[in-house]
């Protein structure tokens, strides 16, 4: 039995990769700030997490995904303030009694000290020093990411 | 380059339904924010409601009762109704993208609405 | 009233530096680094200036610049030319969404 909020990540993800192919992106949007290969979106605004994984969806990009503890230090960083706390694209899927990324993968337990409890209707936001178990319902900040496609050397033909 | 364009009655009676559209070119609607805001001549802005294309609408407080926000974005416009208009309503509106939440990057050039029987 | 409190007016000679001031409390200006400043001429709209405190969209010259301590926002116009002369508008989140504009000030060029 998938939750609502399963449901709609389920939709949204699968919308987002029926969508025509589009050329790679070399360079971050403005507003957008690089981090490595990804450029990412500070939300300035306040949302639940289903709206805020639709808002970043129509921004053909989605909610943040974080590999590694490395790659959440280096977002912790952009985060100017201490008290703000921004959704990222992992909640908690009663089905699988487990945290789950909306790319479908589970949380690798090492990667985050998640502070909060694993149940139903929670979802992860992060701060400038923590990660968090909220209820999705509550209106916070969020970040969407989009891929850098990377630039590949050409290699050309001798002449 | 980015446009908005509004477009709708110049006059509208007390009481009645002010409707205004903005019409963008030049960026899809789908990927920022988008923001009415108004001017009464010669006083100072006041910020009237945001839409975001994945439906979601921000009002201002003030204003909140009376506010409904839409957008089309089969045409790349976006939409104000504010109901039971006064005299107090009588402002160049102006339309603007809202690339965060919190500022207004592109502006339309505004519209005059006089509320007046 | 507006939210925001800007002086009603300022002015500055060409060449000089001016700077206009944007009060708010700690629910608007204090509480998020999400202020903005706009300049207006007679009779067209607004255009941004500055946003998120300090930063400068691309087109709008080096000789404006923001900042903010406390509550208190500033724009400082330097070398001031005679096309600098317009209302200025401070702008701020607000909290749950909502944004609150400043009363305005005149900048004159003398």
């Known amino acids: 039995q998938k939750s609502s909020i399963e449901k709609c990540s389920v939709d949204i993800q699968q919308s987002r990769n029926k969508t025509t192919e589009r050329p790679g992106l070399l360079n971050c949007p403005i507003y957008w700030q690089q981090l490595r290969e990804k450029c990412l979106l500070f939300s300035h605004t306040v949302n639940p997490w289903n709206n805020s994984l639709a808002d970043c969806s129509t921004k053909e990009s989605s909610l943040l995904l974080i590999r590694d503890k490395d790659e959440l230090i280096h977002t912790q960083n952009l985060i100017r303030d201490k008290a703000i706390l921004f959704w990222i694209g992992l909640n908690f899927s009663l089905s699988e009694k487990n945290w789950k990324w909306i790319n479908g993968s589970f949380l690798n337990s090492n990667d985050l000290e998640i502070r909060g409890d694993a149940k139903e209707n929670s979802c992860i936001s992060i701060s400038q020093t923590s990660v968090y178990s909220e209820y999705c319902s509550t209106e916070i900040r969020w970040i969407c990411q989009k891929e850098l496609t990377p630039v590949r050397n050409k290699v050309y033909p001798d002449s | 380059q980015v446009q908005l364009q509004e477009s709708g009655p110049g006059l509208v009676k007390p009481s009645e339904t002010l409707s205004l559209t903005c019409t963008v070119s030049g960026d899809s609607i789908r990927t920022y924010y988008w923001s009415w805001i108004r001017q009464p001549a010669g006083k100072g802005l006041e910020w009237i409601g945001r839409i975001y294309t994945s439906g979601t609408t921000n009002y201002n407080p003030s204003l909140k009762s009376r506010v409904t926000m839409s957008e089309d974005t089969s045409n790349n416009q976006f939409s104000l109704k504010l109901s039971s208009v006064t005299a107090a309503d009588t402002a160049v509106y102006y339309c603007?993208?809202?690339?965060?939440?919190?500022?207004?990057?592109?502006w339309g050039q505004g519209t005059l609405v006089t509320v007046s029987s | 009233q507006s939210a925001l409190t800007q002086p009603p007016s300022a002015s500055g000679s060409p060449g000089q530096s001016v700077t206009i001031s944007c009060t708010g409390t700690s629910s608007d200006v204090g509480g998020y680094n999400y202020v903005s400043w706009y300049q207006q001429h007679p009779g067209k709209a607004p255009k941004l200036m500055i946003y998120e405190v300090s930063k400068r969209p691309s087109g709008v010259p080096d000789r404006f610049s923001g900042s903010k301590s406390g509550n208190t926002a500033s724009l400082t116009v330097s070398g001031l030319q005679a096309e600098d002369e317009a209302d200025y508008y401070c702008?701020?989140?607000?909290?749950?969404?909502?944004?609150?504009f400043g009363g305005g000030t005149k900048l004159t060029v003398l």
């Open positions: 702008s701020s989140y607000a909290g749950i969404n909502n944004v609150v």
């Open positions: 603007a993208r809202d690339p965060l939440g919190s500022f207004f990057d592109y």
